[in-house]
Interface confidence: medium
């Protein structure tokens, strides 16, 4: 097993001990990833986020959207399936939306779901070890030393199989020791979060990248993909790559985990698959994952600006949208030029790769990640990509 993957597994164990993020993924089938069957006609599967049908009470296991929320705790949260009450959320546009989940407190979710996450298996490779050091600059003390446990709200009623997420936070340590998960991956000024360039001085700016022939190391896709495909002797590409292998088709089942359809006029909007031609609403492909940035999650101050992304201490349930004493903002809001603004409104690209930003009461900014042909975006801010094809 190559050094990088071995190291990653060891580091992953440390992350669990440190209560760093991990994710349980339920029903992880190829179909769930929203990938089309080979041979289908070329189709753009899109859906306007603002027109997306909200899935509310009465959603059955075959039709429910899966949701994930980042919360503090040591167990999965498991919703009861049908009959869930909706969670009201604000979309980035300001529209209220209903999320198909009731978020339990961590202490209410304990019980049979307390088994520790499994270490992802690394595929054996005959190639050389890949670097285990991330090509990101050392991040200052504004990063949290801990990140809450990330869990999946499984509305399908099945037991989640835990896997480690690709997002996490960097422990404060020398740049050479940076571990192979990076919560801020999506902020890479040259990478997938290019739109986040409006974050002045954000991690991911290329100032302190190690220099190889005067260039950023080209294994930049590291950490973005959990397709543990080995790489060979070429040193310019990562062991886990979006490009390495194709999606394996599985036997077609009845379409499930569906959301309503809708045509997309503006293709830069939420890029969700709509129903297939000739298929009515409620029978489209599964399309998304929900990820919330937890109330406790510290994003830090944005240098050189008046925007604070760090939720202030206090009861996260307090209604602080308009600010108390002119200092605090409700979770998911940040102070900008004296008023509390939704991070969804303030940062249109807060959710990467076409994800839709929502605000969930007591939870904060919530990214609904989408899938498309060939790729599946996930992560707390949809910054990661999973695929074999």
């Amino acid at each position: 097993v190559p050094a990088r993957e071995t190291g990653s597994a060891i580091e992953a164990e440390e992350l669990v001990r440190s209560s760093l993020a991990w994710e349980s993924r339920a029903n992880d089938t190829r179909e769930e990833a929203g990938l089309p069957a080979a041979g289908e006609d070329e189709t753009s599967w899109t859906e306007r986020g603002s027109e997306m049908a909200a899935v509310g009470p009465g959603v059955g296991p075959e039709e429910a959207l899966e949701a994930s929320a980042a919360v503090t705790g040591t167990a999965w949260l498991e919703a009861d399936g049908p009959g869930l009450g909706g969670v009201t959320a604000e979309a980035g546009s300001g529209d209220a939306q209903t999320l198909p989940a009731t978020l339990q407190a961590p202490d209410e979710a304990l019980g049979s779901s307390t088994m520790p996450p499994a270490i992802p298996e690394a595929t054996e490779t005959s190639g050389p070890p890949s670097p285990a050091v991330h090509d990101k600059p050392s991040v200052g003390p504004e990063l949290p030393k801990e990140i809450p446990l990330e869990v999946r709200l499984n509305l399908g009623g099945s037991t989640p199989e835990p896997t480690f997420p690709l997002q996490g936070t960097l422990e404060t340590q020398p740049a050479s020791d940076i571990i192979d998960i990076d919560y801020f991956e999506g902020l890479d000024s040259e990478g997938r979060g290019a739109d986040m360039g409006s974050f002045p001085g954000s991690p991911g700016t290329s100032e302190n990248h190690p220099d190889t022939e005067g260039e950023t190391p080209s294994w930049s896709l590291l950490d973005l993909y959990d397709d543990f495909t080995p790489f060979d002797e070429s040193d310019f590409y990562p062991t886990t790559s979006f490009y390495d292998d194709l999606e394996e088709e599985e036997e077609e089942e009845e379409d499930k985990d569906t959301v309503g359809g809708g045509d997309l006029e503006d293709e830069n909007d939420l890029l969700l698959p709509s129903q297939k031609p000739g298929v009515g609403p409620g029978t489209g492909q599964p399309t998304n994952r929900w990820h919330a940035v937890p109330p406790q999650h510290t994003l830090g101050m944005v240098p050189g600006s008046s925007i604070s992304l760090r939720p202030r201490p206090g009861d996260p349930g307090k209604d602080l949208a308009s600010g108390e004493n002119g200092t605090e903002c409700r979770v998911g809001f940040v102070r900008h030029n004296g008023s509390c603004r939704s991070v969804c409104d303030l940062f249109p690209s807060y959710c990467h790769n076409g994800g839709q930003c929502y605000l969930v009461e007591n939870i904060g900014a919530f990214c609904r990640c989408n899938t498309q042909d060939y790729i599946w975006h996930k992560g707390m801010r949809c910054e990661s990509i999973i695929t074999d094809f």
């Epitope: 899109t46 070429s234 490009y243 390495d244 292998d245 194709l246 394996e248 088709e249 830069n268 074999d388």
Partner: antibody, heavy 116, light 111 residues
Framework: EVQLLESGGGLVQPGGSLRLSCAAS????????MSWVRQAPGKGLEWVSA????????YYADSVKGRFTISRDNSKNTLYLQMNSLRAEDTAVYYC?????????WGQGTLVTVSS | QSALTQPASVSGSPGQSITISCTGT?????????VSWYQQYAGKAPKLIIF???KRPSGVSNRFSGSKSGDTASLTISGLQAEDEADYHC???????????FGGGTKLTVL
């Protein structure tokens, strides 16, 4: 060193068939998707087909769908492209390439000429 | 399946910088940072020189750089050299069933 070596090209009449092969070495063949990309004389590149590492999934450009079949034999480290019902517009140099979207290694290409 | 749009040819003198554009749509270039550039000498196979918009494989000169703005990706070659004379192809991941789209290619002439 990664090497890809195509063979099987040649002159064929419209409606005819050809089978291209690509012998791969220098990497774990079964771990990677493989693709065929073609280039008509004086034209740009065109992605033709791709196959997953295990061979379980295959994808085709609309222009060849139903006529071309991509396959692989991982025990022989060989990629194939069976081309049937060939048309004049299929005339091109056919390259096999490692991976599917970003092609980090290419073969030298084999010329397929469809002409009567 | 329409190709990405590249100029048919560009030229420059040694030492100069040239930029080759590659224009697509929101379903490809603008939608994802999966733009690659390939260099192809006459009669030879293409060679990857830029991937993910701006990343260089090791061994590729840092005179080659990539960028993207909206629907258009660009390849810039600085300090032009005679050996840069070749065809340059861009490609992008595409959201539709066709997973990769190429440009028509640009012939670079070093005067």
């Amino acid at each position: 060193e990664v090497q890809l070596l195509e063979s099987g090209g040649g002159l064929v009449q419209p409606g005819g068939s050809l089978r291209l092969s690509c012998a791969a070495s220098g990497f774990t063949f079964s771990s990677y998707a493989m693709s065929w990309v073609r280039q008509a004389p004086g034209k740009g590149l065109e992605w033709v087909s791709a196959i997953s590492g295990s061979g379980g999934s295959t994808y085709y450009a609309d222009s060849v769908k139903g006529r071309f079949t991509i396959s692989r034999d991982n025990s022989k480290n060989t990629l194939y492209l069976q081309m049937n019902s060939l048309r004049a517009e299929d005339t091109a140099v056919y390259y096999c390439a490692k991976k599917w979207n970003l092609f980090d290694y290419w073969g030298q290409g084999t010329l397929v000429t469809v002409s009567s | 399946q329409s190709a990405l749009t590249q100029p048919a040819s560009v030229s420059g003198s040694p030492g100069q910088s040239i930029t080759i554009s590659c224009t697509g749509t929101s379903t490809d270039v603008n939608g994802y940072n999966y733009v690659s550039w390939y260099q192809q000498y006459a009669g030879k196979a293409p060679k990857l020189i830029i991937f993910d918009v701006s990343k260089r494989p090791s061994g590729v000169s840092n005179r080659f750089s990539g960028s993207k703005s909206g629907d258009t990706a660009s390849l810039t070659i600085s300090g032009l050299q005679a050996e840069d004379e070749a065809d340059y192809h861009c490609s992008s991941y595409r959201r539709l069933r066709l997973p990769v789209l190429f440009g028509g290619g640009t012939k670079l002439t070093v005067l």
